[in-house]
Interface confidence: low
Amino acid sequence: QPPPPPPDATCHQVRSFFQRLQPGLKWVPETPVPGSDLQVCLPKGPTCCSRKMEEKYQLTARLNMEQLLQSASMELKFLIIQNAAVFQEAFEIVVRHAKNYTNAMFKNNYPSLTPQAFEFVGEFFTDVSLYILGSDINVDDMVNELFDSLFPVIYTQLMNPGLPDSALDINECLRGARRDLKVFGNFPKLIMTQVSKSLQVTRIFLQALNLGIEVINTTDHLKFSKDCGRMLTRMWYCSYCQGLMMVKPCGGYCNVVMQGCMAGVVEIDKYWREYILSLEELVNGMYRIYDMENVLLGLFSTIHDSIQYVQKNAGKLTTTIGKLCAHSQQRQYR
Amino acid sequence: SAYYPEDLFIDKKVLKVAHVEHEETLSSRRRELIQKLKSFISFYSALPGYICSHSPVAENDTLCWNGQELVERYSQKAARNGMKNQFNLHELKMKGPEPVVSQIIDKLKHINQLLRTMSMPKGRVLDKNLDEEGFESGDCGDDEDECIGGSGDGMIKVKNQLRFLAELAYDLDVDDAPGNSQQATPKDNEISTFHN
C-alpha cells in the first residue's frame, strides 16, 4: 500500500498539461490517488493519473513516434522524390532533343523524306519514352520497325524516284527485303545494341529511385505496436503522473526503448546499404553505350550513316530489289 | 568513315560543344545524387539514435527519468531499472518485422539483384563485340567525353551536353527542402506532444 500523499498535494499542474492534450475532459483526479487500475504507469506512490489518461498518453506517444519518424526521413525522402522527378523529366527532355535532332538531320539532308520520316521518328521516340517508363516494349522491335518503315520511303524517294507513289504491296515487299538483304548493313544491329543497353540501364535506374521512395514511404507510415506504445508512454509521460513535469528521459533508456520499438525497421538496414552501393555501381557504369543521353543524342548520326550506307550500295540494291519485288511492282503498274 | 555533309558542321575529329564547363550534365547529377544518398547509408541503423536525439532526453540535467523513477543521469539505474517488471523487450525484438517491412525487404532484395546484374562487368561483353565489328574505337575513355558509334574510324566525340538542369524548375538543394522548415515536427511543436 503506497503512502498517502501530503495533505496539501494537488494534481493541478498535471491537469493543466493534460488539458492541452485533451481539452475539456475531466479525467485528471483533483488530488493524487492510489492508481491501482493503472497498467502502464505503475505507481510507486499516489498518482495523478487515471486509466483513461494512460490510454490517451499511449495514443499520443504513438503519434509522436510516427511524427518523429516522418521528420527523420523527410530530407532523404525529399532527395529521392525530387531526383526521381528530375531524372524522369530529364530523360524525357533527352528523348525530345534526340527526336528533334533526328528530324533536323532528315530535314537538312533528306528533305524529300521528311513528312514520312518525321512520323516514323516520332513513333520510335514515343516508344523509347514508354519503354523508359516501364512499358512492355521490345527494343529490337522498335528499331526494326523504324528501319522497316524508313526503307520503303528511302527506296521510292531517293533510290528509285521514278516509281509511282508507293502502294502497300510493294511497301510490304520492301520491308521484307530490308531485313533479308541487310540493306542498312550492321547499323540497325548497332542501334539495337546501344539503345537496348542504355534504355535498360535508364529504366532500372528510375525503377530503383521509385523503389527508394516506396521504402521510405513504408517505414514512414509504420504503425507502432501496443507494446511499443506502452514503452513510449512509460518513457515520455509516466513521470507526469508523479507530478515530475520538467524531468526528461535518460539517454541510454531512450536508446533501449527506440531499439525495441524499431527492431523491425532496423532489419531493413542491411538491404538499404546494399541498395545504395548497388545503385552507385550502376551509376558508375552509366557511360558510353550505357548512357542514354549519349546514345540517343547520337542516334541522328548513326541513322544518317545508315542511310548513306544504303545510298552507297544503291545500284546493287536497286537491281536486287527490282527482281525480288518485281511481282509487286508489276501488280502496281498494271 | 561516314561522310557528313557540310550542313552538319561536324569537325571530323572532335565535335566541339559550346558550353560552359561548370554546367551540370545528367551524369554529374547522377553522381551527385549518389554522393548525397551515401550520406544516408546508415539511415536505418542510426534511426533509434536519431529519434532519441530529436525528442526530449536529459542532456545536461543531473537527474533523468528511467521509466519508473528519477535517477542520477550516469547511474546504472538510468538505463536498466526502467525495464524491470515491464513486458519483455527481448520478446518485442523476437516478433520480427511487420509484414509490410518484410514485403519491402523482398522488393529491395529483388532490385539489388537487378542492379548488380546490370552492373556486372561480364554483362559488358558488348563493348568488345562492337570493336570487332568495327563500330567502336577504343580511344574514348574520358570522363566527360563520351563516344557515339559512327561507322568505321569516323568516331565522333560528343560532349555530354544536355543542359537538363536549365530546363527543369527544380532546385535540389536540400537546404530548401520542405523538411527543413516543417511546421509540426515534435521539435518545433512540442506543446502538443512533450512538455519541456
Epitope: K107, N108 | D7, D11, E167
Partner: antibody
Framework: EVQLVESGGGLVQPGGSLRLSCAAS????????MSWVRQAPGKGLEWVSS????????YYADSVKGRFTISRDNSKNTLYLQMNSLRAEDTAVYYC???????????????????WGQGTTVTVSS | QSVLTQPPSVSGAPGQRVTISCTGS?????VHWYQQLPGRAPKLLIY???NRPSGVPDRFSGSNSGTSASLAITGLQAEDEADYYC??????????FGGGTKLTVL
C-alpha cells in the same frame, strides 16, 4: 566583332523586284544556318526564310513561298534574298539573322537567332 | 501555321517583377525570347527556354511548361522598356514568333 550588315532595300512598285544582301563578318559564316526576318511598320517580327549552312536546304514562310528566293555565297560570306512579285504587304524592315547554336555544333534549327543585322527597309508602294 | 500568343502589353514600376507569357508552343521545341529596344534590331535574350547568352543580366529568366512559356524580369529598370518577342518552331521546323509584348516601366 560578330556583325551582319544588310543592304539592297529601297522603294519599289507592286509587282517589282529587289535583291537584299547581308554581309557577315566575325564568325565562320559557312558553319551556320541563316535567316531573314521582317517587321512591318508598327507590327511584330515575322520569319521569312532560312537557308542551311551549305545552301542546299531552303525554307520559306507560306506568305512568300514562290516569290522569294534565299541563297548564300559562302566564299563571299554573304546571304541574299531575291524578292519578286512584291506586294504592299511586303513593306517592312528586313533583318538577316544568324541561327544560334549551342550543344551539338550542327544543330542550328531550333536554338534561336543570336546575331541580327541593323535591318534594311523595303517599301512597296505605287 | 502555329501561332504563339503574347499579351500586347505589360507594365511595372522600377524594382518590381513582371512576367510575360507565351502560349501555343505545342511542337515540343524550345522557346526563345528577344528584346527589341525602340528603333533597334532584336536581341536574343533567352535561348532554350531559360538560358541567358553572355551579357544578359540575370534579372531576366525564362521558364517553360508544356505549351506555355514565360519570361520574368525582376528588379525592373527604365532601360528594360522595350518590345519582347517569344519564338519557337512549328512541326516543320520553321520559325514562328509571338505577336510581341510592349513593356512599359512606370
Amino acid at each position: 566583332e560578330v556583325q551582319l550588315v544588310e543592304s539592297g532595300g529601297g522603294l519599289v512598285q507592286p509587282g517589282g523586284s529587289l535583291r537584299l544582301s547581308c554581309a557577315a563578318s566575325g564568325f565562320t559564316f559557312k558553319r551556320y544556318a541563316m535567316s531573314w526576318v521582317r517587321q512591318a511598320p508598327g507590327k511584330g517580327l515575322e520569319w521569312v526564310s532560312s537557308v542551311s549552312s551549305s545552301g542546299t536546304g531552303t525554307y520559306y514562310a507560306d506568305s512568300v513561298k514562290g516569290r522569294f528566293t534565299i541563297s548564300r555565297d559562302n566564299s563571299k560570306n554573304t546571304l541574299y534574298l531575291q524578292m519578286n512579285s512584291l506586294r504592299a504587304e511586303d513593306t517592312a524592315v528586313y533583318y538577316c539573322a544568324k541561327e544560334y547554336d549551342y550543344g551539338l555544333g550542327w544543330m542550328h534549327y531550333y536554338y534561336g537567332m543570336d546575331v541580327w543585322g541593323q535591318g534594311t527597309t523595303v517599301t512597296v508602294s505605287s | 501555321q502555329s501561332v504563339l500568343t503574347q499579351p500586347p502589353s505589360v507594365s511595372g514600376a522600377p524594382g518590381q517583377r513582371v512576367t510575360i507569357s507565351c502560349t501555343g508552343s505545342s511542337s515540343g521545341y524550345d522557346v526563345h525570347w528577344y528584346q527589341q529596344l525602340p528603333g533597334r534590331a532584336p536581341k536574343l535574350l533567352i535561348y532554350g527556354s531559360n538560358n541567358r547568352p553572355s551579357g544578359v543580366p540575370d534579372r531576366f529568366s525564362g521558364s517553360n511548361s508544356g505549351t506555355s512559356a514565360s519570361l520574368a524580369i525582376t528588379g525592373l529598370q527604365a532601360e528594360d522598356e522595350a518590345d519582347y518577342y517569344c519564338q519557337s518552331y512549328d512541326s516543320s521546323l520553321n520559325a514562328i514568333f509571338g505577336g510581341g509584348t510592349k513593356l512599359t516601366v512606370l
